[in-house]
Interface confidence: medium
């Protein structure tokens, strides 16, 4: 029977800068029941607080709801593991919510083949930002990436769309069925998951000639 091993805070994520969750991995339990607590303070302050919500994020997590989330402050947190034989602490983790945003995937992905008479045909792709993100405040800049491929192909073709929420693609293989997906990323944060795939059949008479 031993004191617990050192826990490790391995991830923090926020869907929108308004709430966030951090997760830890327990160390060895030393063969005894072990209790875990996450404590934190804000940079420049000495007052320590305990995790406000150990439930919402699932096992070995701490969730910070709206009332506990400040955008312009750095949180300094650590996890304490305790059993009858002693305690151990994780390394301190510094968290500024700006740097942990991982949005939900973009919504309402629409794909259409456009064949104007006077110009080249193209694939028109349009989407909406995820609902939890409020772009009107100016706090957020979302960048988008599109990927597409013929249904049976192994390799994805990737296009960076910048801040646009629509995109045109000119070079496609006629007669093929394509999968199209989009994802988004805030300026300092993480890429979202890819949106569910939308399928589009490219007509056989779709021509890439001038």
């Amino acid at each position: 029977q031993l004191p617990p091993g050192k826990p490790e805070i391995f991830k923090c994520r926020s869907p929108n800068k308004e709430t966030f969750t951090c997760w830890w991995r327990p160390g060895t339990d030393g063969g005894l029941p072990t209790n875990y607590s996450l404590t934190y303070h804000r940079e420049g302050e000495t007052l320590m607080h305990e995790c406000p919500d150990y439930i919402t994020g699932g096992p070995n997590s701490c969730h910070f709801g709206k009332q506990y989330t400040s955008m312009w402050r750095t949180y300094i947190m650590m996890v304490n593991a305790t059993n009858q034989m002693g305690s151990s602490f994780s390394d301190e983790l510094y968290v500024d919510v700006t740097y942990i945003v991982q949005p939900d995937p973009p919504l309402e992905l629409a794909v259409e083949v456009k064949q104007p008479e006077d110009r080249k045909p193209y694939l028109w792709i349009k989407w909406s930002p995820p609902t939890l993100i409020d772009l009107k405040t100016g706090w957020f800049t979302l960048l988008y990436e599109i990927r597409l491929k013929p249904e049976k192909a192994a390799e994805w073709e990737i296009h960076f769309a910048g801040q646009q929420t629509e995109f045109k693609i000119l070079s496609l293989h006629p007669g093929q069925k394509y999968l199209v997906q989009v994802r988004c990323k805030p300026d300092h944060g993480y890429w979202s998951a890819w949106s569910p795939a939308t399928f589009i059949q490219i007509p056989s008479d779709f021509t890439m000639n001038d």
């Epitope: 490790e8 805070i9 390394d91 510094y94 968290v95 500024d96 942990i100």
Partner: antibody, heavy 123, light 110 residues
């Protein structure tokens, strides 16, 4: 406990290539930025390159830009440095270093280091 | 190129207090934190001070760090023979998008 074990060093001719590996254990490799730092014989430390936790962001020192490529395989807990067009001035001990988890600006440092692998570029 | 400036050498007698300086610019020390490493002969560097003044567990409180403007310093009090090593300061440089080191200071315990 955290362990970083470099391999792949050796003697190579100018203009040649070498691929260094760093096997990591004792921590959640996929959560951390990782870096390469080198030290020429009898000289100081020089940062070479860093890669983000997911592998999507990479940064290089000007002295190696366009010649070296950093990458990682999170499924194998391994960091790589592909070194092409090697020059005599690339001769050094190459250290693999872990960057602590920190989600804020201006915090960048190296909390664990491997023992290093020697790369000698000479004809 | 060495971006942060350190004195090449420093020395002191056992029990003495020694200070090593590190000078940078607004794009590194001026806007980011400073870290210090100790490299004993023939070994890999070891983190000594992080975020200007924090000590990792296991580092004695004889070692302390401070930062002011675009300069930082490492102080070692109660100098011991085992402190004889090379000491490097390091920061992040926002304009280079990378890490920068000082040239190192060789500390001799007389």
């Amino acid at each position: 406990q955290v362990e970083l074990l470099e391999s792949g060093g050796g003697l190579v001719q100018p203009g040649g290539s070498l691929r260094l590996s760093c096997a990591a254990s004792g921590f959640t490799f996929s959560s951390y930025w990782m870096s390469w730092v080198r030290q020429a014989p009898g000289k100081g430390l020089e940062w070479v390159s860093s890669v983000s936790d997911t592998g999507t962001d990479t940064h290089y020192a000007d002295s190696v830009k366009g010649r070296f490529t950093i990458s990682r395989d999170n499924s194998k807990n391994t960091l790589y440095l592909q070194m092409n067009s090697l020059r005599a001035e690339d001769t050094a001990v190459y250290y693999c270093a872990k960057t602590p988890l920190a989600y804020s600006s201006g915090w960048y440092y190296f909390d664990y280091w491997g023992q290093g692998t020697l790369v000698t570029v000479s004809s | 190129d060495i971006v942060l400036t350190q004195p090449p050498s420093a020395s002191g007698t056992p029990g003495q207090r020694v200070t090593i300086s590190c000078s940078g610019s607004s794009s590194n020390i001026g806007s980011n934190t400073v870290n210090w490493y100790q490299q004993l002969p023939g070994t890999a560097p070891k983190l000594l001070i992080y975020r200007n003044y924090q000590r990792p567990s296991g580092v004695p409180d004889r070692f302390s760090g401070s930062k002011s403007g675009t300069s930082a310093s490492l102080a070692i009090s109660g100098l011991r023979s085992e402190d004889e090593a090379d000491y490097y300061c390091q920061s992040y440089d926002s304009s280079l998008s990378g890490s920068v080191f000082g040239g190192g200071t060789k500390l001799t315990v007389l």
